[in-house]
């Protein structure tokens, strides 16, 4: 997260760290007791590594009573996701068992109504991604409030030049932005999950290259079918 601040500890009980061989790889969001939603591209280079999900965490390194690392029983990338596009960049991870819920571990309601969030709406994005252009990784969860950007502006040639489909949304990126390591994390508007940080190699913090988020409402049928 660029230009953000440390989050209040455990105030986002839906927040997950998707880990590869014990190290933070991507963000994720608990959407059901046994399911975490993240980004498909996160597992592209995972190969034979061990993928796990950390729930109930604020610090990645310090012991916390609510922290627990779960093995992954099943990883379900969206069937249409491809390495070279930002489209359909969603991944559902089934935990080895139902998460132990409590004040610091709680699923987040996700948007099912397929309607665009109004431009200018302030949404919260959180993650353990890099916090500066030098690539410094934080130990504690960071967050930032970002205004939603209308799709037409996001599709301008100087922005994302037509790449933003109706299944994607954008948020402003003027110094405050999601960045590398935040992919798969939640964009939350009005207490509801609206988007998932896409995991492309986008430049961060440049206002002409807005953050791109996969609209979960557009994938409600797929999410429901996997969780069923």
């Amino acid at each position: 997260i660029l230009g953000g601040r440390e989050a209040e500890a455990h105030a986002r009980p839906y927040m997950a760290s998707v880990q590869l061989n014990g190290a933070h790889l991507c963000g994720g969001v608990l959407v059901a007791e046994q399911w975490v939603l993240s980004a498909a591209h996160c597992l592209e280079d995972a190969a034979d590594g061990k993928v796990q999900v950390l729930l109930g965490a604020h610090s990645l390194s310090q012991p916390e009573p609510s922290k627990r690392l779960y093995d992954v029983l099943r990883a379900v990338p969206h069937p249409d996701s491809q390495p070279d596009t930002i489209d359909h960049d969603l991944l559902l991870l089934q935990l080895s068992e139902k998460a132990t819920l409590g004040p610091a571990v709680r699923p987040l309601p996700w948007q099912r109504v397929d309607r665009d969030v109004a431009p200018g709406t302030l949404c919260d994005v959180a993650g353990w991604g890099i916090v500066n252009h030098a690539g410094r990784r934080p130990d504690s969860l960071q967050h930032v409030l970002l205004p939603v950007l209308d799709r037409a502006t996001c599709n301008r040639r100087t922005h994302h030049d037509g790449a933003i489909t109706e299944r994607l949304m954008c948020a402003e990126s003027n110094r405050r932005d999601s960045c590398k390591g935040d992919s798969g994390g939640p964009l939350v508007c009005g207490g509801v999950l609206e988007g998932v940080v896409t995991s492309g190699s986008r430049v961060c913090g440049n206002r002409k290259k807005p953050g791109i988020y996969t609209r979960v409402a557009s994938y409600a049928a797929w999410i429901d079918s996997v969780l069923a």
Epitope: D150, R151, A152, R157, T158, D161, V203
Partner: antibody, heavy 116, light 112 residues
Framework: EVQLVESGGGLVQPGGSLRLSCAAS????????MNWVRQAPGKGLEWIGD????????DYNADFKRRFTFSLDTSKSTAYLQMNSLRAEDTAVYYC?????????WGQGTLVTVSS | DIQLTQSPSSLSASVGDRVTITCRSS???????????LEWYQQKPGKAPNLLIY???NRFSGVPSRFSGSGSGTDFTLTISSLQPEDFATYYC?????????FGQGTKVEIK
């Protein structure tokens, strides 16, 4: 298939007005800026300006700002170009073109002739 | 406003020839985001322009590989490696980095 269809061109007297339409289909109208470009007979391409179909924000080439106005009817997926105080040098083919990717999609153009 | 000057204004060539068109801008067209929005369009009589090249050197989908773009800063080039009968047309460079966006005056490629 993305389609842009202009209409409303024709013969108009100097000092007169005309409203051109650009009807879009094959995509979500509010997802892309619409631009207007004109081409005088035997001449090059000249950008008039653009409009954001979500916010209605506009940007005009300074040469056209006082006499030309953009508007929208999103329910009809249509952009409009209102041209006032027309002069002989406004005689041209007028195109609408969607921005994103680049100017990949253009209408067929509509000819406006300003003559007495 | 940024002026784009194309040269030559017209040229005569034969099928199979290698054709080069240059476009010079009055100032740099590197955008504040670091990209250069220099595009090339082909237009045939009575038709709307067609996008060939975007961001200096990227061919738009469906554009034959004989078309290529290059350049940086203020000097840009469109090259047709082996001219085909359907390539006889007028070519325009365009800059989208700075408002107002502008077109070059065009280069007409005619049959020799």
């Amino acid at each position: 298939e993305v389609q842009l269809v202009e209409s409303g061109g024709g013969l108009v007297q100097p000092g007169g007005s005309l409203r051109l339409s650009c009807a879009a289909s094959g995509y979500v109208f509010t997802s892309y800026y619409m631009n207007w470009v004109r081409q005088a007979p035997g001449k090059g391409l000249e950008w008039i300006g653009d409009i954001n179909p979500v916010t209605g924000d506009t940007d005009y080439n300074a040469d056209f700002k006082r006499r030309f106005t953009f508007s929208l009817d999103t329910s009809k997926s249509t952009a409009y170009l209102q041209m006032n105080s027309l002069r002989a040098e406004d005689t041209a083919v007028y195109y609408c073109t969607r921005e994103g990717p680049s100017f990949a999609y253009w209408g067929q153009g509509t000819l406006v002739t300003v003559s007495s | 406003d940024i002026q784009l000057t194309q040269s030559p204004s017209s040229l005569s060539a034969s099928v199979g020839d290698r054709v080069t068109i240059t476009c010079r801008s009055s100032q740099t067209i590197v955008h504040s985001n670091g990209d250069t929005y220099l595009e090339w369009y082909q237009q045939k009589p009575g038709k709307a322009p067609n996008l060939l090249i975007y961001k200096v050197s990227n061919r738009f989908s469906g554009v034959p590989s004989r078309f290529s773009g290059s350049g940086s800063g203020t000097d840009f080039t469109l090259t047709i490696s082996s001219l085909q009968p359907e390539d006889f047309a007028t070519y325009y460079c365009f800059q989208g980095s700075h408002v107002p966006v502008t077109f070059g005056q065009g280069t007409k490629v005619e049959i020799k």
